[in-house]
């Protein structure tokens, strides 16, 4: 069965600036990755950037810099002032989107005990 | 403007074969994911098999499997169903479908559809 | 397969009336449902992508809510041209599973 990692990073050098680290593990090829925070995108979450492998990238603030990885896993840098920059406790999540296969989701946020700059 | 065409329907015996053709227009074919979806006389929608954009993955309903075959030529713009050893309920009109990946694999565009008629 | 159930089969309205379509799906869909209108001798059209979403022509009086497993399609103000065949679908597992269909008929 597919499954979905989520990692969060709080950066070392901007305290309130997130980094959200994704892959798909699974065989099929991916048609789009969906990123949300403050729950799933069909839960009341918030979409901050979807990724297609061939049609591009698009990206909303507090989104700053969303890319492929590798061809099964994506990084997305948020801004990290402002009144909607996220917050220590703040839920991300990942949707991975595979035709025919199907979707898959999961969701991570930044451990209490993390330190800026450990990965989560 | 997006058009999806079908051709190949017709009355077959049991036992018989068909190929359905769906001819399309307005839009990169190549990148968009495809489907066969039937409606038997006065019933639902049913999918049929889908393929994937990049050839790569297919899908067939279990009632079809070994009988069916999805191909697509993007050079050609076309999406192709071969059917062999019809039964009598697969009676039905055949329609080809488009999948949008940013609609959540909705399918956005629908051919005519082509009536499939096993009888003997 | 996930099992994506309509109710009721029928309805038997008069325009001008606002109607609420059920689905439900027999496990969790997250966003992925769309729903579609089919009128006789017509293939289907869609309506609604992404539970909400109308898609490009669809008058406003078309919406879609819903989360998780129980979604509903409502036309605020029924027209003489929205009488037709209803049914939903999900797109988050394969396969790709239809409702049966609701149908809304002038009474």
């Known amino acids: 069965t597919p499954e979905v990692w989520v990692q969060v990073r709080m950066e070392a050098t901007e305290l309130s600036s997130f980094t959200i680290r994704c892959g798909f593990l699974g065989s099929g090829s991916i048609s789009l990755v969906t990123v949300s925070w403050g729950g799933p995108n069909g839960a009341g979450g918030t979409t901050l950037a979807v990724l297609h492998p061939e049609r591009g990238i698009r990206q909303w603030a507090p989104a700053r810099q969303a890319r492929w990885e590798t061809q099964s896993s994506i990084s997305l840098i948020l801004e990290g002032s402002g009144a909607s920059s996220p917050c220590a406790n703040t839920t991300f999540c990942c949707k991975f989107a595979s035709f025919p296969e199907g979707s898959w989701e999961a969701c991570g946020s930044l451990p209490p005990s993390s330190d800026p700059g450990l990965s989560a | 403007e997006v058009q999806l065409v079908e051709s190949g329907g017709g009355l077959v015996k049991p036992g018989g074969s068909l190929r359905l053709s769906c001819a399309a227009s307005?839009?990169?074919?190549?990148?968009?994911?495809m489907s066969w979806v039937r409606q038997a006389p006065g019933k639902g929608l049913e999918l049929v098999s889908a393929?994937?954009?990049?050839?790569?993955?297919?899908y067939y309903l279990d009632t079809v499997k070994g009988r069916f075959t999805i191909s697509r030529d993007n050079a050609k713009n076309s999406l192709y169903l071969q059917m062999n050893s019809l039964r009598a309920e697969d009676t039905a009109v055949y329609y080809c479908?488009?999948?949008?990946?940013?609609?959540?694999?909705?399918?956005?565009?629908w051919g005519q559809g082509t009536l499939v008629t096993v009888s003997s | 397969e996930i099992v994506m159930t309509q109710s009721p089969p029928t309805l038997s309205l008069s325009p001008g009336e606002r109607v609420t379509l059920s689905c439900k799906a027999s496990?969790?869909?997250?966003?992925?449902v769309a729903w579609y209108q089919q009128k006789p001798g017509q293939a289907p059209r869609l309506l609604i992508y992404?539970?909400?979403n109308r898609f490009t022509g669809i008058p406003a009086r078309f919406s879609g809510s819903g989360s998780g497993t129980d979604f509903t399609l409502t036309i605020s103000s029924l027209q003489p041209e929205d009488f037709a065949v209803y049914f939903c679908?999900?797109?988050?597992?394969?396969?790709?599973?239809f409702g049966q269909g609701t149908k809304l008929e002038i009474k």
């Open positions: 307005g839009f990169t074919f190549s990148s968009y994911h």
């Open positions: 479908a488009r999948h949008e990946d940013y609609y959540g694999f909705a399918m956005d565009y």
């Open positions: 496990q969790s869909v997250s966003n992925d």
């Open positions: 679908q999900q797109a988050y597992r394969s396969p790709w599973t």
């Open positions: 992404y539970v909400s």
């Open positions: 393929i994937n954009s990049n050839v790569i993955s297919t």
